[in-house]
Interface confidence: low
């Protein structure tokens, strides 16, 4: 389906507002340090150019690829060398190398100030004064901080952001209406960003075969009534969508995502009975709803898998004829029968099955060799089941904050070389698995927990890739996507680690501690906990608990004092001395 002008094609398909929003997101994800006004100017220039191409597809430069047009535009930024350093060298390259170069310079942890939320009245005034600018600013600020955010989904978030302000800025109690909505959008946005980052890592680091395997497993769980051919078609289309978005081709991605939603809604009968309410919604909500749709009911009469995949004498013949199709069908059949398994477990089972066939189909008696293959699955299934059980028990016993602390200690002992902010961020997020998944019924716990942990550990992997400090982390992150979580779970105390020298400055606190929010106080305390473990990796749980209890008491005492700063100055050194003695 070729078009004389790609930019005109996408402008017409997407409409002006989506086109402009997506171009703004694309530019903000590439040039994360550029000021908002600069990006708006570039987007307006591209949009005006697109309109000339819509009017006349034969006009000058309208036949150029989107990468060429967008790359040329980005390379007009005057301060590229000063602001981005070696990224400016990308502009000396030709497409497609130039785009690859820009992609490689995306920064998962950009040095940007945290977003501060202004007073509600200030936000409502800004919203009413210039709604369009207000919403563009939202797209820009989110996109530059999350350079792999799923762009069409970010438009959905922006729509919800707008709706929240439209409703709440007219409410009697604006803050009570707006703040919970903004908190929800922030938390959902961070989760969405992290999930998409795993999809992009899967495609970029492990190839589209890995992504397709993930998609076969997940879609087979969601759509167990769909035929394998239908699931395969959806997987192919979904892979194209995510490949495009992860590659910075946001216009194509959004267009293809809309086409996929249209296809699914036109073919509901052969996909799932759960799609109906999604398909009644407008475009952005429809695509979001389809992505989040609950699993359909399993067909009642599914036969045992053993007949086709163990007992049949034709297993090796079928496998040899089309390995990927046969393994894909195995994964489909297993996944549709097991919505209670995590996707990562299903992929491990498929991998184990593949390894068994590779070995057995070369053996003297293949059937005898692979006859017990399903028995080999049992330990693979039990490992995540036990892990979820143990951790949910611990979460229920400790509560979220102390559960996070237990994980902080556990992970700092495993990989003490990792930076303290990264350990705090990752462990806090690992700890959120409790509240997210442990309250669910047994059949939903493992898919919730393990697939969430995969997303969080991917964040550790992408941050570590930027600044590699631990061979263990590199090994777990790069060897196998499906075994990342078991790899990290299996890590023990790093005996080779040389404990960090004690630095009193790290444990010096001031009166500003008292004005922090509860979350910020927790982060401060958890930062201190990581530093303690780095200083004394062999400290026992009891020793660490004693120090942390003393710390909490010391902070509480000084925050109640009349002269808070004086209290911190006096009590701080005593706390440090007592802590050193307790850990000696």
């Amino acid at each position: 389906d070729t078009h004389k002008s790609e930019v005109a094609h996408r402008f017409k398909d997407l409409g002006e507002e989506h086109f402009k929003g997506l171009v703004l997101v694309a530019f903000s994800q590439y040039l994360q340090q550029c000021p908002f006004e600069e990006h708006v100017k570039l987007v307006n220039e591209v949009t005006e150019f697109a309109k000339t191409c819509v009017a006349d597809e034969s006009a000058e430069n309208c036949d150029k690829s989107l990468h060429t047009l967008f790359g040329d535009k980005l390379c007009t930024v005057a301060t590229l060398r000063e602001t981005y350093g070696e990224m400016a060298d990308c502009c000396a390259k030709q497409e497609p190398e130039r785009n690859e170069c820009f992609l490689q310079h995306k920064d998962d942890n950009p040095n940007l100030p945290p977003l501060v939320r202004p007073e509600v009245d200030v936000m409502c005034t800004a919203f009413h004064d210039n709604e369009a600018t207000f919403l563009k600013k939202y797209l820009y600020e989110v996109a530059r901080r999350h350079p792999y955010f799923y762009a069409p989904e970010l438009l959905f978030f922006a729509a919800r952001y707008k709706a929240a302000f439209a409703e709440c800025c007219q409410a009697a109690d604006k803050a009570a209406c707006l703040l919970p909505k903004l908190d929800e959008l922030r938390d959902e946005g961070k989760a969405s960003s992290a999930k998409q980052r795993l999809k992009c890592a899967s495609l970029q680091k492990f190839g589209d075969r890995a992504f397709k395997a993930w998609a076969v497993a997940r879609l087979s769980q969601k759509f167990p009534k769909a035929e394998f051919a239908e699931v395969s078609k959806l997987v192919t289309d979904l892979t194209k969508v995510h490949t495009e978005c992860c590659h910075g081709d946001l216009l194509e991605c959004a267009d293809d995502r809309a086409d996929l939603a249209k296809y699914m809604c036109e073919n509901q009968d052969s996909i799932s009975s759960k799609l109906k309410e999604c398909c009644d919604k407008p475009l952005l909500e429809k695509s979001h709803c389809l992505a989040e749709v609950e699993n359909d009911e399993m067909p009642a009469d599914l036969p045992s898998l053993a007949a086709d995949y163990v007992e049949s004498k034709d297993v090796c013949k079928n496998y040899a004829e089309a390995k990927d199709v046969f393994l894909g069908m195995f994964l489909y059949e297993y996944a549709r029968r097991h919505p209670d398994y995590s996707v990562m477990l299903l992929l491990r089972l498929a991998k184990a099955y593949e390894a068994t066939l590779e070995k057995c189909c070369a053996a003297a008696d293949p059937h005898e060799c692979y006859a017990k293959v399903f028995d080999e699955f049992q330990p693979l299934v039990e490992e995540p089941q036990n892990l979820v059980k143990q951790n949910c028990e611990l979460f229920e016993q400790l509560g979220e904050y102390k559960f996070q602390n237990a994980l902080l200690v556990r992970y700092t002992k495993k990989v003490p070389q990792v930076s303290t902010p990264t350990l705090v961020e990752v462990s806090r997020n690992l700890g959120k698995v409790g509240a997210k998944c442990c309250k669910l019924p047994e059949a939903k716990r493992m898919p919730c927990a393990e697939d969430y942990l995969s997303v969080v550990l991917n964040r550790l992997c992408v941050l570590h890739e930027k600044t590699p400090v631990s061979e263990k982390v590199t090994k777990c992150c790069t060897e196998s996507l499906v075994n990342r979580r078991p790899c990290f779970s299996a890590l023990e105390l790093d005996e080779a680690y040389v404990p960090k020298a004690f630095n009193a400055e790290t444990f010096t606190f001031h009166a500003d501690m008292c004005t922090l929010s509860e979350k910020e106080k927790q982060v401060k305390k958890q930062t201190a906990l990581v530093e303690l473990v780095k200083h004394k990796p062999k400290a026992t749980k009891e020793q660490l608990k004693g120090v942390m209890d003393n710390f909490a008491a010391f902070v509480e005492k000084c925050c109640k004092a009349d002269d808070k700063e004086a209290c911190f100055a006096e009590e701080g050194p005593k706390f440090v001395a007592a802590s050193q003695a307790a850990l000696a």
Epitope: E17, E131, L135, A159, D280, P282, E285
Partner: nanobody, 122 residues
Framework: EVQLVESGGGLVKPGGSLRLSCAAS????????MNWVRQAPGKGLEWVSS????????YYADSVKGRFTISRDNAKNSLYLQMNSLRAEDTAVYYC???????????????WGQGTLVTVSS
């Protein structure tokens, strides 16, 4: 199949009133923002008013503010435009149009009615 059918147009004197209706079918009406758009003879399309899916957010073009009132009845799958203090410059074909996006942020419409003619003349 999505269908939008307008009615209620006609000839009215300046200063008079009319109420336009739009009957919707073939989709879940209560999920969509709806709009009135008009086209004066020999002119381009002009957006007139929009109403959010639940009817809580309403917007008007400056040219009709204070004179026109948009409303909807989701139970009846109907959209309305009450037009008061009509002027000669309100003469146009009035279309009801569905917004494919839930926000009203985007003024691009995926389905239109066939239109109803309103003529304001003495």
């Amino acid at each position: 199949e999505v269908q939008l059918v307008e009615s209620g147009g006609g000839l009215v004197k300046p200063g008079g009133s009319l109420r336009l209706s739009c009957a919707a079918s073939g989709f879940t009406f209560s999920n969509y923002n709806m709009n009135w758009v008009r086209q004066a003879p020999g002119k381009g399309l002009e957006w007139v008013s929009s109403i959010s899916s639940a009817g809580t957010h309403i917007y008007y073009a400056d040219s009709v503010k204070g004179r026109f009132t948009i409303s909807r009845d989701n139970a009846k799958n109907s959209l309305y435009l009450q037009m008061n203090s009509l002027r000669a410059e309100d003469t146009a074909v009035y279309y009801c149009a569905r917004d494919p996006h839930s926000t009203g942020w985007y003024k691009d419409f995926d389905y239109w009615g066939q239109g109803t003619l309103v003529t304001v003349s003495s």
